[in-house]
Interface confidence: low
Amino acid sequence: KSSNEATNITPKHNMKAFLDELKAENIKKFLYNFTQIPHLAGTEQNFQLAKQIQSQWKEFGLDSVELAHYDVLLSYPNKTHPNYISIINEDGNEIFNTSLFEPPPPGYENVSDIVPPFSAFSPQGMPEGDLVYVNYARTEDFFKLERDMKINCSGKIVIARYGKVFRGNKVKNAQLAGAKGVILYSDPADYFAPGVKSYPDGWNLPGGGVQRGNILNLNGAGDPLTPGYPANEYAYRRGIAEAVGLPSIPVHPIGYYDAQKLLEKMGGSAPPDSSWRGSLKVPYNVGPGFTGNFSTQKVKMHIHSTNEVTRIYNVIGTLRGAVEPDRYVILGGHRDSWVFGGIDPQSGAAVVHEIVRSFGTLKKEGWRPRRTILFASWDAEEFGLLGSTEWAEENSRLLQERGVAYINADSSIEGNYTLRVDCTPLMYSLVHNLTKELKSPDEGFEGKSLYESWTKKSPSPEFSGMPRISKLGSGNDFEVFFQRLGIASGRARYTKNWETNKFSGYPLYHSVYETYELVEKFYDPMFKYHLTVAQVRGGMVFELANSIVLPFDCRDYAVVLRKYADKIYSISMKHPQEMKTYSVSFDSLFSAVKNFTEIASKFSERLQDFDKSNPIVLRMMNDQLMFLERAFIDPLGLPDRPFYRHVIYAPSSHNKYAGESFPGIYDALFDIESKVDPSKAWGEVKRQIYVAAFTVQAAAETLSEVA
């Protein structure tokens, strides 16, 4: 199908014209402009950047660009009462203190308003006690400690290394284990790539570098004080005691120089195995407490951060559709950063800016997309996806009726090895077809397609000759659109060759060293990877907004549903006796998946044959495609997670960054052998199979012939 047919525009205004207008040099220039000072959410600097982007998007040619503001709960350190951790002797004297700030990178020594490292939303407190090293503080790490090693974290301060899972899950796990404080640190094993120098001489984390980040467990709620509703001028706010997702114990992050000083004295139990050892010159003893000579010394945390309701600003730009203005394709990424945001988010924001400029250029030449494109610069993503979630809460009725797709645009790069895509199965074919048309930027793949280099470097584990595409999890602004509203979503960026370290981020993530120079010197000097990501993100938006028939293939959903059903069944079959005792059957789910597969196949045949010149039938077929993702939404949500409503996908309960399939069944089965009431536990498994089977069957029926 030709994208041109949509609005009877001249042939030069096709996808190629849009892609050819994207320029690496512009992305580079925009990145420089966005990274010269910090743009922390809730600050004047970030408000000024919002107004600058609003003005520039108007100049680029969008029909309208508005600021949407909300008053949400944010968290900041106390400038006169800094946070730190100390080792104290038996007299209470502080014999070692962690650093109060990161040494600024060259050229940035005189920049003001660099927020010192802190864990956003940590409560205030000054707990002191023995230290317990808990590895990554994952669910399985606490199982190992408590069940196998019989180590009790109750009343202890735990120290955990960053990586593998979202930091909020670490804090939640520590709270559940009874800890009274959490110290998070970056171990060189996870944040120092062998053979690469530390910043400013390379892209590795120096010993004084620290990862900032929020430690909430919002489960999709948005602003902690106004869950489910926008934090507008007349909002009713919960008291802080009823706020959603706030941690109850003090938390603070440190770098590996400081971590060395705490960990080198650790005594108690030896690490259970080599997977608990990082790369510091310490024994990685678990504790509790310090060894021999140091056994009377304790660790004390000094946390004085405050939570404040603060105004944030989204920028929302509109390019009205010529044929279906009431159908929205959204491209959104955040603008707020922890410090300079060299990668996160401005490498993404610069790409969005260039995509807007290219679309604006086409519009000035008389072109319009078939459907409306909305562009968003979200605020306060770093504080819990707040800007995007509040806007979606405010506009939920419009979005659930009109939302075709959401494409996320945070960091464009986390490496420079190959493409990484996470998306709904509906977009698999779109991504495959698009990347076959784009040139690979990779060395050794000159003249080859992006699809070819991507497939070679990141092959699908299931299908030979195809690239890996991952499930959507969370930890970014697509969450509300996909997990709550059921709008087909996707994200793309360039990544590293580091599959085992998937959720640890790049070494300088959320540190002061995430600068323009980091990108320009070490990651992408020619900005060719940024350009490729702009082509992928922009190309997806162009096709979604302009193709006559929506570029969704429902058959790909059928394939993954079967795979996910097989996977969850095999997990359950680890308990054959209980399945027999409690009459647990997956027949209903497999039957629903079979029906979905057959109906999707028939729908796809009709899609090939129908009369595309009939606007009513065209709209009807497109609506069936648009609403398919919506059909997987359960209005009641998942157990204890009402804002995660997608039955097929949810963020893992053990790692917000990761996606889990059939999450309701998965969570019901998780650790089921330890449940005190097995009859009740297996009853919940059966209920979740019922919900999943019903949802898949109901979704299938939305694809049936309407009459």
């Epitope: 120092f192 062998p194 120089y257």
Partner: antibody, heavy 122, light 107 residues
Framework: EVQLVQSGAEVKKPGSSVKVSCKAS????????ISWVRQAPGQGLEWMGG????NYAQKFQGRVTITADESTSTAYMELSSLRSEDTAVYYC???????????????????WGQGTLVTVSS | DIQMTQSPSSLSASVGDRVTITCRAS??????LNWYQQKPGKAPKLLIY???SLQSGVPSRFSGSGSGTDFTLTISSLQPEDFATYYC?????????FGQGTKVEIK
């Protein structure tokens, strides 16, 4: 796969110097941490020194110099004021791990050259 | 400088035997201890790094344990190709140092 290929055997007079080369292939040379280890006939292994960070065993201090030419991916070990007890096989080795600029984190000598026999005899 | 002491200096064993070699450091080296195997006329080969991690391609009958100052290399069931000299080496602090070696001979 990384390979280290050393220069050929040498016969030297006491008091002279010897310079052994070690060419690396199959990876980024700048990320290698090259060390030199020697083994006298019938004796054990003796670490002489290494780069990244540069450090020499006390026993060889002032007599050994370890250098590298990144453009040719070649490391060199020069030992001066040779004596008969310097007769040994000299190995060029890669240490796995890295140097952070603060600590070194090395986990073993995982790639070895084939060895160069240096004989010191009058 | 850190001294490494291996024991025994030699041992005789038969195929199928369980063999244990110990290595002691003069001060704590955490887990920065590596084990090598050397056969006559050949370069040494890394077996175990970081006290207990098996180098890729090394048979699972080799295992290492210990941390701090005392370390052990164990061959669970000696095979004909395992008769060789074994060295420990510390990579905690430069200058690095080797143990004097343990020769495993056929009984």
């Amino acid at each position: 796969e990384v390979q280290l290929v050393q220069s050929g055997a040498e016969v030297k007079k006491p008091g002279s110097s010897v310079k052994v080369s070690c060419k690396a292939s199959g990876g980024t040379f700048s990320s290698y941490a090259i060390s030199w280890v020697r083994q006298a006939p019938g004796q054990g292994l003796e670490w002489m020194g290494g780069m990244t960070p540069k450090n020499y065993a006390q026993k060889f201090q002032g007599r050994v110099t370890i250098t590298a030419d990144e453009s040719t991916s070649t490391a060199y070990m020069e030992l001066s004021s040779l004596r008969s007890e310097d007769t040994a096989v000299y190995y060029c080795v890669r240490a796995s791990g890295y140097y952070s600029g603060y600590h070194s984190y090395y986990y073993g000598l995982d790639v070895w050259g084939q060895g160069t026999l240096v004989t010191v005899s009058s | 400088d850190i001294q490494m002491t291996q024991s025994p200096s030699s041992l005789s064993a038969s195929v199928g035997d369980r063999v244990t070699i110990t290595c002691r450091a003069s001060q704590s080296i955490s887990y920065f201890l590596n084990w090598y195997q050397q056969k006559p006329g050949k370069a040494p080969k890394l077996l175990i790094y970081a006290a207990s991690s098996l180098q890729s391609g090394v048979p699972s009958r080799f295992s290492g344990s210990g941390s701090g100052t005392d370390f052990t290399l164990t061959i669970s069931s000696l095979q004909p190709e395992d008769f060789a000299t074994y060295y420990c080496q510390q990579s905690h602090t430069m200058p690095w140092s080797f143990g004097q070696g343990t020769k495993v001979e056929i009984k």
